[in-house]
């Protein structure tokens, strides 16, 4: 913390300029006026401020608002951005787009993806959902920033807004992710042919269930292996050995080169040996010819 | 074939909070989407919500604030419940299996459990 | 959400004659529209999907047309087992909705 002194009478402080880099860390904390500070922000990132100094600005603020920010301060926060932890971020209410633009402008080149995701958050929380215009802004500004959000956040997506996503923005997704933005891009595409259908749906297909891998098999849509390899587990187990040849069409091959990794490695491992020496591509590690498969799923059904 | 079948109380007190479980027997819970429609007394079917096995859900706004849709992919169940109950919920509750075929792309249903029915009621 | 609104709430038909049942909706949900058949103390039964498509099982006498906001279920000649209550559901949208529904009486 910095320590309290008083403010010597020529070093009082009636406006925010250039002449407070020449202030030390403990005059700026004696003679800057947060109330001040906070009304002058959009002057801060013009001033080559050092980082030690920036801290005590900080500070300042952190004192006048201890329950975060008003938006008016975050807007000009620059790159005192830069300062902020996301324990700091989680005070704040942010609506505004342009809010977001300078602070992820500010935060690019920096190791600040904690920070930038707890924004984002923020963000959608204080617009009440992730509309267009955010995802429009996050796809521009912050690439593979969607990806940051938790899946409840993303719940928030209208099927609309789909359509603005880019398959580069799903790069980092993860499962649970896939989940719930999986069926909101099924639904926004339903209506096209199958073939423009597929292009749309591919990024998202990592949160298919099985059913609608198989009903892909039947429409020879050629899956590339990258896509293949980001299904589901649980959803490519359940896939026969034709299912599969049909889905992926001439890039079928390229299992030889994924046997050992999964889903591919999972699912050879529940195939028959015989169906599998029906692709001609060499896999082993099927079924053996000879024994019994009880799939258990279905033991309700048996009892 | 796949079944479903729809199990929980049958009353339950205003200000309470409903329960309900659907078994899926005959196929895996992790092939499709699940969903819970409801219909009071000689009224229309409303929708509440789905869920996927991984537990991502998704329901209808005028119900979303007291709706919590939960599976158990180890019993091959799900759930619902409903919580702040009023007699306007009293309904026969089914769950119901989304038709999940991108060839015909939908968000409609399939199969049906019987349907239980839930009075509220003090 | 989009209403979907059925008329007419009661038909009357004899046996062996053509019903014609309508769905409207308050947007358009292009085709994505399903029928379905309900029968007293049972669960709805799929009909048609897609507006126009018969779900597995359904016999031919069942068509459905329409896309947009104008639909219609056309049962061709009523046997005595179609006398139920038939409801349409629009799925272009969430919330997924229903319209109220459509008896089917024997006159």
């Known amino acids: 913390d910095v320590e309290r002194t008083t403010c010597p009478p020529e070093k009082e402080v009636h406006e925010i300029d250039e002449s407070l880099i020449f202030y030390k860390k403990r005059e700026l904390e004696a003679c800057v006026d947060a109330a001040l500070l906070a009304a002058q922000m959009d002057r801060v990132d013009a001033i080559p401020f050092t980082y030690e100094q920036l801290d005590v600005l900080k500070h300042k603020l952190d004192e006048l608002y201890p329950q975060g920010y008003p938006e008016s301060v975050i807007r000009h926060l620059g790159h005192l951005f830069l300062k902020m932890s996301p324990e700091d971020i989680r005070k704040w209410n942010v609506t505004s787009l342009e809010t977001l633009k300078a602070l992820l402008k500010v935060s690019k080149g920096h190791e600040m993806s904690a920070q930038v995701a707890t924004l984002i958050d923020r963000v959608v929380v204080g617009r009440g959902q992730l509309d267009k215009d955010t995802v429009d802004t996050l796809t521009a500004f912050c690439p593979g920033c969607l990806c940051s959000l938790s899946p409840e956040r993303l719940s928030s997506v209208p099927p609309s807004v789909i359509g603005a996503v880019r398959p580069q923005d799903l790069d980092t997704c993860g499962p649970r992710q896939l989940d719930v933005l999986y069926p909101k891009a099924r639904l926004a595409f339903q209506n096209m042919s199958g073939s423009e259908y597929f292009v749309k749906i591919r990024p998202f297909l990592g949160g298919a269930p099985t059913e609608d891998v198989k009903a892909l098999s039947q429409q020879n849509v050629s899956m590339d292996l990258a896509t293949f390899m980001k299904l589901r587990r649980e959803a490519v187990l359940p896939l026969t050995v034709a299912e599969v040849q049909k889905l992926l069409g001439p890039h079928v091959e390229g299992l030889k080169v994924e046997e050992q990794h999964s889903p591919v490695r999972d699912w050879i491992l529940k195939q028959r040996q015989d169906d599998l020496d029906t692709l001609g591509l060499g896999l082993q590690g099927g079924i053996p010819n000879g024994y019994l498969i009880l799939d258990l799923s279905v033991r309700e059904a048996l009892s | 074939q796949v079944q479903l079948q729809e199990s929980g109380p049958g009353l339950v007190k205003p200000s309470e909070t409903l329960s309900l479980t659907c078994t899926v027997s005959g196929g895996s819970i992790q092939n499709y989407y699940w969903s819970w429609v409801r219909q009071p007394p000689g009224k229309g079917l409303e929708w509440i919500g789905y869920?996927?096995?991984?537990?991502?859900?998704n329901s209808n706004p005028s119900l979303k604030s007291r709706v919590i849709i939960s599976v158990d992919t180890s019993k091959n169940q799900f759930s619902l419940k409903l919580s702040s109950v009023t007699a306007a919920d009293t309904a026969v509750y089914y769950c119901?299996?989304?038709?999940?075929?991108?060839?015909?792309?939908?968000?409609?249903?399939?199969?049906w459990g019987r349907g239980t029915l839930v009075t509220v009621s003090s | 959400e989009i209403v979907m609104t059925q008329s007419p709430a009661t038909l009357s038909v004899s046996p062996g004659e053509r019903a014609t049942l309508s769905c409207r909706a308050s947007?358009?949900?292009?085709?994505?529209l399903a029928w379905y058949q309900q029968k007293p103390g049972q669960a709805p039964r799929l009909l048609i999907y897609?507006?126009?498509t018969r779900a597995t099982g359904i016999p031919a006498r069942f068509s459905g047309s329409g896309s947009g906001t104008e639909f219609t279920l056309t049962i061709s000649s009523l046997q005595s087992e179609d006398f139920a209550v038939y409801y349409c559901?629009?799925?272009?949208?969430?919330?997924?909705?229903f319209g109220q529904g459509t008896r089917l009486e024997i006159k």
């Open positions: 559901q629009q799925y272009n949208n969430w919330p997924l909705t």
């Open positions: 897609g507006a126009s």
């Open positions: 869920i996927f096995y991984s537990g991502s859900t």
């Open positions: 119901a299996r989304e038709v999940g075929r991108i060839a015909v792309a939908g968000w409609f249903f399939d199969l």
């Open positions: 947007q358009s949900v292009n085709s994505n």
